[in-house]
Interface confidence: low
């Protein structure tokens, strides 16, 4: 780690739209990118009548909003699509929804990694 931060080398991959996009549905994604840029993991999901539907998970490019976040937490209040990002290998394996100024239960990611998917 550099300056105490966790280097992201790989993230959990998931694509609900895998058939149309012609990718695997799940796997482990190696994160590539410029050496001078930070890499992150992300998760995005929807809450359909209390049921969690994961949309995508994977690597995320250098984004200041993700710096030094070890946990993947969405803080926006009731977004249409939930999004979180984090730093650290497979840190998007679990994700939570904690809107600021409000207390709710965390949402855990039920997806289990499958064999690696490569682009």
């Amino acid at each position: 780690a550099i300056l105490g931060r966790s280097e992201t080398q790989e993230c959990l991959f998931f694509n609900a739209n895998w058939e149309k996009d012609r990718t695997n549905q799940t796997g482990v994604e190696p994160c590539y990118g410029d050496k001078d840029k930070r890499r992150h993991c992300f998760a995005t999901w929807k809450n359909i009548s209390g049921s969690i539907e994961i949309v995508k998970q994977g690597c995320w490019l250098d984004d200041i909003n993700c710096y030094d976040r070890t946990d993947c937490v969405e803080k926006k209040d009731s977004p249409e699509v939930y999004f979180c990002c984090c730093e650290g290998n497979m840190c998007n394996e679990k994700f939570s929804y904690f809107p600021e100024m409000e207390v709710t239960q965390p949402t855990s990611n039920p997806v289990t990694p499958k064999p690696p998917y490569y682009n």
């Epitope: 149309k20 996009d21 012609r22 994160c31 590539y32 490019l61 699509v81 490569y118 682009n119």
Partner: antibody, heavy 120, light 107 residues
Framework: EVQLLESGGGLVQPGGSLRLSCAAS????????MHWVRQAPGKGLEWVSN????????GYADSVKGRFTISRDNSKNTLYLQMNSLRAEDTAVYYC?????????????WGQGTLVTVSS | DIQMTQSPSSLSASVGDRVTITCRAS??????VNWYQQKPGKAPKLVIY???SRASGVPSRFSGSGSGTDFTLTISSLQPEDFATYYC?????????FGGGTKVEIK
Amino acid sequence: EVQLLESGGGLVQPGGSLRLSCAASGFTFDDSSMHWVRQAPGKGLEWVSNINYNGGYTGYADSVKGRFTISRDNSKNTLYLQMNSLRAEDTAVYYCAKSANWHDTALDYWGQGTLVTVSS
Amino acid sequence: DIQMTQSPSSLSASVGDRVTITCRASQSILSYVNWYQQKPGKAPKLVIYAATSRASGVPSRFSGSGSGTDFTLTISSLQPEDFATYYCQQSYELPLTFGGGTKVEIK
């Protein structure tokens, strides 16, 4: 320095075929997803096709599906686009472009383009 | 397919002006938006990726914002070399789709 150099364009009659090539250098080609994007004269950009690092996954725009085939030869650092059953509306400058990272987030390098003209 | 609606299609501005170009997606695409600059007879050049991140070598006067369906490219102080056509592009899913372009012309 990343370089992408397209070739193979030219004048072809409707119904004819062309094979475009894109020679890549300056980056690890066999790690990179690649794309073809075209631009008709005076018009905007239209994505045509993509291929993953080893050719295992390909994608096509509906307008070219069944007529165009994308492929790559990693030993030659070259991307190809085989275009069959060409139509007048396929007339465009064809660019090859490289994905910025594994996740297909953006196209960070583009070639200079090669012009394909379909006309009788 | 996801439609990307860009506006305006053209604008006239002077050197030093603040220029804003908008792009609207037909569905939520998170931050999967990129912006390109294209000059006549040249290939497009990546300016902004992932909605807000400047590509390597791009001046700080270029910035991007937005998430979900509405996105903006802003040039804080237009320079002579910025007169060009700008395109937004979604990379949320295949097929990748582009906006119709915004031509930034000299007033």
